[in-house]
Interface confidence: low
């Protein structure tokens, strides 16, 4: 005999107490797949969480973080405090990046400046707490007689692609 529960669509549950009838999920619950015997309770976005997508009968609510916080983990399971650019979050709160490191985002850790000399290049623009150094041509390229017809390409900000 075919299991009648398999015919219950998303948004319903198979209620065995009612001879395997598909009952719509009660308010504040959902089933995202067919054939479910229970509906799951909707996630509530409270405190540092705010609602990005309301719960429906077929899909759970989705949360974001309130202003000043950012999501961490799968499906924004945690909210972490934002810091300013040039800072990183430590156990004692937001701290400025140490000399020789930078962070160009409101999250994450401070990273060391690029070592231009490893690529045989020179520092064109010094690094800051918020920005990495910009490497320019190698010192040899800048010696007298070297062609300077094409200036170095302007540095792109991280995350930006060429137009």
């Amino acid at each position: 005999l075919q299991d009648l529960c398999s015919n219950c669509p998303a948004g319903t549950f198979c209620d065995n107490n009612r001879s395997q009838i598909c009952s719509p999920c009660p308010p504040n619950s959902f089933s995202s797949a067919g054939g479910q015997r229970t509906c799951d309770i909707c996630r509530q976005c409270k405190g540092v969480f705010k609602t990005r997508k309301e719960c429906s009968s077929t899909s759970n609510a989705e949360c974001d973080c309130i202003s000043g916080y950012h999501c961490l983990g799968a499906e924004c399971s945690m909210c972490e405090q934002d810091c300013k650019q040039g800072q990183e979050l430590t156990k004692k709160g937001c701290k400025d990046c140490c000399f020789g490191t930078f962070n160009d985002q409101k999250r994450g850790i401070c990273r060391p400046w690029t070592n231009c000399s490893l690529d045989g290049k020179s520092v064109l623009v010094n690094g800051t707490k918020e920005r990495d150094v910009v490497c320019g041509p190698s010192p040899a390229d800048l010696s007298p007689g070297a062609s300077s017809a094409t200036p170095p390409a302007p540095a792109r900000e991280p995350g930006h692609s060429p137009q």
């Epitope: 669509p9 948004g11 009952s23 997508k53 077929t58």
Partner: antibody
Amino acid sequence: QVQLQQPGAELVKPGASVKLSCKASGYTFTNFWINWVKQRPGQGLEWIGNIYPGNTGTNYNERFKTKATLTVDISSSTAYMRLSSLTSEDSAVYYCARGQLGLDYWGQGTTLTVSS
Amino acid sequence: DILLTQSPAILSVSPGERVSFSCRASQIIGTTIQWYQQRTNGSPRLLIKYASESLSGIPSRFSGSGSGTDFTLSINNVESEDIADYYCQQSHSWPFTFGSGTKLEIK
């Protein structure tokens, strides 16, 4: 405010197909089911099926499974119902209505006339 | 499919009276019943959800009751603007079904 806009009337020849529209406004389109309901002149209401724009999941009344096809266009917040192989029995007012259980907002209905 | 039987087909009352509409389901459906009003040439309007929950914007003279298989829509102090067809609808299982409707007339 919530609104569901439907064209007033459609005239189609027997054997042809028609695509009825229902443009939603005043709420988040992807968060609510859109239902379609048929009403023949002087008759009661008949549920055709529904679609959830958030994941395009559909449920159909078995009687309409080969007759109706439900789709949505998220970019324009519009739901569509395509009716195929039309006969005089398909002449009716077709309503779209928002809601998962209680149908809380209804369009004005499209009067479909199937006639040669 | 769940069959909803509405009775009577026509109800005739005088203004100011109380009127009750009946809806009987072919199987136990808890409280998953809605009631709609449809005036002549108009779209249906949701009056009551989950058998007895009232909705904002609906006059308080409309009320619903019942569970299991027997449900009732009542209107206190009927007014002339209540002339319409009244339908029950179940949301217990697919496909959703409507009753055949009861027409309210004013004497």
